[in-house]
Amino acid sequence: TIDTKRNISAEEGGSVILQCHFSSDTAEVTQVDWKQQDQLLAIYSVDLGWHVASVFSDRVVPGPSLGLTFQSLTMNDTGEYFCTYHTYPGGIYKGRIFLKVQESS
């Protein structure tokens, strides 16, 4: 199963950690995909390392753990984010986070 904070908020210009937690007695995580709606943010592969999409490379920092740190937030970053866990033996698990970027006070 995937456990996430369903709704999170952060200030414009600030940063936020996107994190999903996967638990299973039988499957091991081999890859985690992170997407902003349908757009790829980053991929973590246990064997291959991290790939961060070039369009986000100046704002997305891998980690902590299998999560992402999303920096220099803008109002346009408000929306749905998805983590997809690829496991072995076969199995794909998805989690959803809604990020609300608020105007800085």
């Epitope: 081999t30 592969s45 064997d47 291959l48 390392g49 790939h51 690829h86 033996p89």
Partner: antibody, heavy 125, light 107 residues
């Protein structure tokens, strides 16, 4: 550019164990973040993924072959190997070794980027 | 496991014509699809990854499209060296699976 070369006996008797080695040249197997894979192709048929081993040491096998397959890496020889036990005539095929994920960190895809030339293995008494 | 189905099994095309090959996944693979070309007696060669990106050294006449469960490989103007068998393959879900192949032959 990494290159791969398969080697091993071309003829194996039924019920015995098929053993193949893939020698990697052009780079060190120990300093590379790839999946090292084995794929086979029976005569006149399509491609079948046998299994892969990652740099973490984790192995991933085709469920249909899992009980008979072992893939391992020998970093000192810059090789990885395949063992397939209890073979039958249906295991007769061209066996390929391949590298998966060679461009992952730059482009984010996982595919079989580099292939060996293949080696034909016949199972017959 | 994800089953990959290719159609047609054989495609007869004249040199210079366009060839359109289809690949269907039994469940969504997003854009995680690759295409390979295999000529007789040779190992497969990676053509397309990420459903639509040409691998290094692959001519522009090869193009891939699609996402989710439906994918297409198009060869815009077939050259003599393009007559071969083409396979699609999904990844990263385990196990890796290939389609059964499409043979492109001279009409």
């Amino acid at each position: 550019q990494l290159q791969l070369q398969e080697s091993g006996p071309g003829l194996v008797k039924p019920s015995e164990t098929l053993s193949l080695t893939c020698t990697v040249s052009g780079g060190s197997i120990s300093s590379s973040r790839y999946y090292w894979a084995w794929i086979r192709q029976p005569p006149g048929k399509g491609l079948e993924w046998i299994g892969s081993i990652g740099t973490s040491g984790s192995t991933y096998y085709n469920p249909s072959l899992k009980s008979r397959v072992t893939i391992s890496v020998d970093t000192s020889k810059n090789q990885f190997s395949l063992k397939l036990s209890s073979v039958t005539a249906t295991d007769t095929a061209v066996y390929y070794c391949a590298i998966e994920g060679a461009n992952f960190r730059d482009f984010g895809y996982v595919a079989f980027d580099i292939w060996g030339q293949g080696t034909m293995v016949t199972v017959s008494s | 496991e994800i089953v990959m189905t290719q159609s047609p099994a054989t495609l007869s095309v004249s040199p210079g014509e366009r060839a359109t090959l289809s690949c269907r996944a039994s469940q969504s693979v997003s854009s995680n699809l690759a295409w390979y070309q295999q000529k007789p007696g040779q190992a497969p060669r990676l053509l397309i990854y990420g459903a639509s990106t040409r691998a290094t050294g692959i001519p522009a006449r090869f193009s891939g499209s699609g996402s989710g469960t439906e994918f297409t490989l198009t060869i815009s103007s077939l050259q003599s060296e393009d007559f071969a068998v083409y396979y699609c393959q999904q990844s990263p879900p385990w196990p890796r699976t290939f389609g059964g192949g499409t043979k492109v032959e001279i009409k």
